[in-house]
Interface confidence: medium
Amino acid sequence: RAQLERSLRDVVEKTIQKYGTNPEETAAEESWDYVQFQLRCCGWHYPQDWFQVLILRGNGSEAHRVPCSCYNLSATNDSTILDKVILPQLSRLGHLARSRHSADICAVPAESHIYREGCAQGLQKWLHNN
């Protein structure tokens, strides 16, 4: 099991680091988006794992961005962000069969309304039970 967890960690790291860089290879990204959406988590141990991803970096050093699957909808009151950016992206997560293109990558100013927990614990628990 330890070996499996280490392998999973490596796969997740690669997926996060390469997120959005190849529009032809989005299966792993979609799967990870789905994990974050379903488990209500963000990143491996920390949401900050996303902040090093070049394609998601904001202009300013503090303007960090994350994929919309990290967003806690129940904590978000900004209707503009919700209606125009987050909800259209999250609706796709319910239809994984639909292909996602690079233009659909959802990155909006982060920090306040994202899931604060990483996904590692939840996934490890799931692995443990299966």
């Epitope: 280490r6 960690r9 491996w44 141990h45 920390y46 900050q48 794992d49 902040f51 090093q52 960090h64």
Partner: antibody
């Protein structure tokens, strides 16, 4: 640009309590993105991690050091502090405060104070 | 707690390539970060993670990891690279940090 500045006594007597503060400018102590730590370096020796505190107040300490250290954070002052009780000559060192960056894949301190030399002597 | 082991001293001829290594069980799970420290100065982060170099750090500094060993490579060492170098990582528990003992680099 983030800057950190240590302050505290340069000389402490054995068995007394050492208190050091680190004032942070150019960034918020309250940010969830970072952690704040203390590292010391005895004269002519290597770096030794003392402990780390998060904005939530959760603190972690070097398990190989005796539990004489306490790190606390005062977000209103944008300061975090180190207390070391019952000091001995072995605690003589340059003490650095530093800001770390949260990440699952590695640990790092990206910004450091210039360090303050603390000498324990009677 | 986990330990990180470094060679105490390494030397390199001016303009040559040198590799500074750091060994420890926790490096199987976490990448290392590398700091340069010159006498009387605070440490400076020179490399971290898989392939991250902070801005302002020359591209002659690079890093790699294999198994339980992390390496910092300086390609074309300069006189100003003479310093102590420390590796840093999480320990195996993930909650604590640990530094290597340091490597004194001499540029001949």
């Amino acid at each position: 640009q983030v800057q950190l500045q240590e302050s505290g006594p340069g000389l402490v007597k054995p068995s007394e309590t050492l208190s050091l503060s680190c004032t942070v400018s150019g960034g918020s102590l309250n940010s969830y993105n970072y952690y704040w730590g203390w590292v010391r370096q005895p004269p002519g020796k290597g770096l030794e991690w003392i402990g780390t505190i998060y904005s939530s107040g959760s603190a972690y300490y070097n398990p190989s050091l005796k539990s004489r250290f306490t790190i606390s954070v005062a977000t209103s002052k944008n300061q975090f502090s180190l207390r070391l009780s019952s000091v001995t000559a072995a605690d003589t060192a340059v003490y650095y405060c530093a800001r770390g960056y949260r990440n699952s894949w590695y640990a790092l301190f990206e910004y450091w104070g210039q360090g303050t030399l603390v000498t324990v002597s009677s | 707690s986990s330990e990180l082991t470094q060679d105490p001293a390494v030397s390199v001829a001016l303009g040559q390539t040198v590799r500074i290594t750091c060994q420890g069980d926790s490096l199987r799970n976490y990448y290392a970060s590398w700091y340069q420290q010159k006498p009387g100065q605070a440490p400076v982060l020179v490399f971290y993670g898989k392939d991250n170099r902070p801005s302002g750090i020359p591209d002659r500094f690079s890093g790699s990891t294999s198994g339980n060993t992390a390496s910092l490579t300086i390609t074309g060492a300069q006189a100003q690279d003479e310093a102590d170098y420390y590796c840093n990582s999480r320990d195996s528990s993930g909650d604590h940090l640990v530094f290597g003992g340091g490597t004194k680099l001499t540029v001949l």
